[in-house]
Interface confidence: low
């Protein structure tokens, strides 16, 4: 003899991303010559056996046999969420419930609050916001490959009462190394299935210049031509270069952009030379010790701020 349970239909809960397709499958062992039926959370019949009951082109029959009724709902909306009921009209009527959960996909995050041309050691504060997630998404920050610790993600219900807007802020002190860095806000959510959904903000940092003196050739000898290149870096790039020689009347004349030229080296050129690179952010002086008596000059790894 068949037990009563053999006439009890069974189904399963389903999770679907908004816009996706969900398949609802209901099975029964003993149908007792009765048809299976699917109805929606509003108790509207969707299919009774192979007969369509609701005019909604998104709902299609997948399979209808005496032991199974499977339907698909395409382009699922948040409003489709709820308990779907599979019924078999035996005596008594038996039902099985399928809870359909619809995930809201978070929108691409928006970064606000960036103030252009930050100065070194100033604090940058950026805000990130993403709407449309269900359940609420999480936001994370990074600077290049480095994780930034933003504040806790704030959650606000969207006007539709179903999805959420999440937001987070991050503050950090900028350094010269951050010039040109990308600050990335990423949204993490189960609907994305690991796919990256992020927005980046490139930041510019203004900082005092640095400079380095490079001799050309690297090992000049007496009688040779020597160029001392003053290579300035900074943001903005230094525009003014002034050369001095310790013990001499400043400044020395440049003959080629930022370079100091010695057409014909002699021993009297020996000494320590300073190149001051200046931008509107400040000045920096690099030094170089030239000893023409030796076969090669001895550079001094040197610098000063002003």
């Amino acid at each position: 003899n068949l037990s009563q349970d053999d006439s009890q239909p069974w189904t399963s809960d389903e999770t679907v991303v908004a816009g996706g397709t969900v398949v609802l499958k209901c099975q029964v062992k003993d149908h007792e010559d009765s048809s299976l039926q699917w109805s929606n959370p509003a108790q509207q019949t969707l299919y009774f056996g192979e007969k369509r009951a609701l005019r909604d082109n998104r709902i299609q029959l997948v399979s209808s046999t005496p032991h199974e009724l499977s339907i698909s709902i395409s382009n699922v909306a948040l409003a489709d969420e709820g308990e779907y009921t599979c019924s078999i009209f035996t005596m008594p009527v038996r039902t099985a419930k399928s809870l359909v959960t619809v995930l809201g996909i978070p929108q691409k995050p928006i970064i606000t609050g960036y103030k252009s041309s930050l100065r070194e050691k100033e604090t940058a504060t950026l805000n990130c916001q993403s709407s449309g997630s269900k359940p609420a998404a999480q936001l994370t920050w990074r600077k290049g490959d480095q994780e930034l610790h933003g504040d806790q993600t704030r959650i606000q219900e969207d006007p539709n009462g179903k999805t959420f807007t999440v937001s987070s802020s991050v503050s950090f002190q900028v350094t010269r190394e951050d010039d040109g860095a990308n600050i990335v806000c990423s949204v993490n959510h189960e609907s994305l299935k690991g796919a990256d959904r992020s927005t980046s903000q490139r930041i510019e940092v203004l900082y005092t210049p640095t400079a380095m003196i490079r001799p050309e050739p690297a090992h000049p000898r007496e009688g040779q031509k020597l160029l001392l290149h003053c290579e300035g870096r900074g943001n903005p790039v230094p525009q003014q270069y002034v050369w001095v020689k310790e013990g001499s009347e400043p400044p020395l004349k440049m003959t080629q952009e930022s370079a100091l030229i010695f057409p014909f080296l002699n021993k009297s050129d020996s000494g320590t030379y300073g190149c001051t690179a200046t931008s509107n952010m400040g000045s920096y002086t690099a030094y170089f010790t030239l000893n023409v008596n030796d076969p090669s000059p001895v550079p001094s790894s040197s610098s000063t701020y002003h």
Epitope: T208, Y287, S300, S301, S302, S303, T304, Y305
Partner: nanobody
Framework: QVQLVQSGGGLVQPGGSLRLSCAAS????????RGWFRQAPGKEREFVAA????????NYADSAKGRFTISRDNSKNTLYLQMNSLRAEDTAVYYC?????????????????WGQGTLVTVSS
Amino acid sequence: QVQLVQSGGGLVQPGGSLRLSCAASGRTFSNYARGWFRQAPGKEREFVAAIDYSGGSTNYADSAKGRFTISRDNSKNTLYLQMNSLRAEDTAVYYCAAPASRRPSWDADGYDYWGQGTLVTVSS
């Protein structure tokens, strides 16, 4: 002439912290860069950290990055090295140093004046 007098060394357990100080006298301290070096038994003296005259620029050896902090108080003519998360391999004699001109250098050859050295022992 510059005199550099160090203090603050001693014995500390792994994971512990120490703060080294280096007081300068003689010439105006604030005009010049300062550096810390160390020499472990049987090894060469190695660069640890340096700071420029204004305190605006610092440089650290890879072994010190993230654990050590160099700073200076020009009003007190004093240089500091805060050492956190100390390891056994940090055991060494630590020296503060100053160059004869306003030129920060990450090479011991760039320094003309040296402190007397202070022993830091990291051991459980």
